[in-house]
């Protein structure tokens, strides 16, 4: 999905007032220096591909992100302000379903929500020179 | 306007199923989560599950695990709820209500209005 | 699970009086996820207060809603007579979805 005609501004309220609160939620008990961030992202478009990517594509050590609140309110954020992209995802899904399993929150799970904080934080300051 | 209209109200016998319609128009409806809420005589709400038009994704409460399926027919813009093994415990009012972001905090913004379910032999 | 705790389970008030409803949650939510719908004989919910204190819209001012945490509460400072309802708390921080059990605002 290309995500450059989505409604950056409106995501990123939706991420602040909400979403944010609820990654803080999942990694609680965990200190902010715990992971190095490793992901990053160079604009909105590409910050939206990575954020999608980490919060629904099973990974080796954490299948189970997809079933999270956080997850749930970014998937609605996507499809509300990125036009067609709830269509995109049919195909995707599909695929993916048999893979997903429920809330085991590994260590590895934890550290991908680290560097998808990274990411929204990154996506919420589109102007400044990447590192 | 946003508006969800469900079917019409239902008597069953225990041990069988129920599915209960949700007729969504006024908005992109495979944009929208849409959940089901339901109230037996008296009680109060209990949130029963979710799914996601778009793909057909769920999230059921464990509570009715293995009892209560969502689907939803894009084609129609109508998502559905079925739930089997009834037992008089299940007689209630059944309720769909989307999921939408409301100045940006996420909550059940539209509700439908109600189908009563009656379990009884 | 996150369980909602409302209290009292029934408010008796005269109109022009002010009810405070109660909602107590099992563990710490963030304020965004706190929401209380209003539920009137026979009808379906309506939502009332949105992330613990933005009223849904055309929603009047005498009700208000505030708290942080694990306590969260609803105000109506001068009860009208339309006001007279059962109201619901509900989290929206973690699976599965809760509410609170309702506090029916009766009229004394």
């Known amino acids: 999905y290309d995500f450059t005609n989505c409604d950056f501004e409106k995501i990123k309220a939706a991420y602040l007032s909400t979403i944010s609160k609820d990654l803080i939620t999942y990694m609680s008990g965990t200190k902010s220096t715990e992971f190095n961030n490793t992901v990053s992202c160079s604009n909105r478009p590409h910050c939206l591909t990575e954020i999608q990517s980490l919060t629904f594509n099973p990974t080796a050590g954490c299948a189970s992100l997809a079933k999270e609140m956080f997850a749930m309110k970014t998937k609605a954020a996507l499809a509300i302000w990125c036009p067609g992209y709830s269509e995109t995802q049919i195909n995707a899904t599909q695929a993916m379903k048999k893979r997903r399993k429920r809330k085991v929150t590994t260590n590895k799970c934890l550290e991908q929500v680290s560097q998808l904080q990274g990411l929204w934080r990154r996506f919420n300051r589109p102007l400044l020179k990447q590192q | 306007q946003v508006q969800l209209v469900q079917s019409g109200a239902e008597v069953k016998k225990p041990g069988a199923s129920v599915k209960v319609s949700c007729k969504a128009s006024?908005?992109?409806?495979?944009?929208?989560?849409m959940n089901w809420v339901r109230q037996a005589p008296g009680q109060g709400l209990e949130w029963m599950g979710q799914?996601?038009?778009?793909?057909?994704?769920?999230n059921y409460n464990g509570k009715f695990k293995g009892r209560v399926t969502m689907t939803r027919d894009t084609s129609t813009s109508t998502v559905y709820m079925e739930l089997s093994s009834l037992r008089s415990e299940d007689t209630a009012v059944y309720y769909c209500?989307?999921?939408?972001?409301?100045?940006?905090?996420?909550?059940?913004?539209?509700w439908g209005q109600g189908t009563t379910v009656t379990v009884s032999s | 699970e996150i369980v909602m705790t409302q209290s009292p389970a029934t408010l008796s008030v005269s109109p022009g009086e002010r009810a405070t409803l109660s909602c107590s949650v099992s563990?710490?939510?963030?304020?965004?996820?706190l929401h209380w719908y209003q539920q009137k004989p026979g009808q379906s919910p309506r939502p009332w207060i949105y992330?613990?204190?933005t009223l849904a819209s055309g929603i009047p001012a005498r009700f208000s809603g505030s708290g942080s945490g694990t306590e969260f509460t609803l105000t109506i400072s001068s009860l009208q007579s339309e006001d007279f309802a059962v109201y619901y708390c509900?989290?929206?921080?973690?699976?599965?979805?809760?509410f609170g059990g309702g506090t029916k605002v009766e009229i004394k």
């Open positions: 799914i996601f038009p778009g793909d057909g994704e769920t």
């Open positions: 509900q989290q929206w921080s973690s699976y599965p979805l809760t």
């Open positions: 006024g908005y992109a409806f495979s944009s929208y989560w």
């Open positions: 992330g613990t204190s």
């Open positions: 209500a989307r999921g939408g972001y409301v100045n940006f905090l996420y909550a059940m913004d539209y």
């Open positions: 563990s710490s939510i963030s304020s965004s996820n």
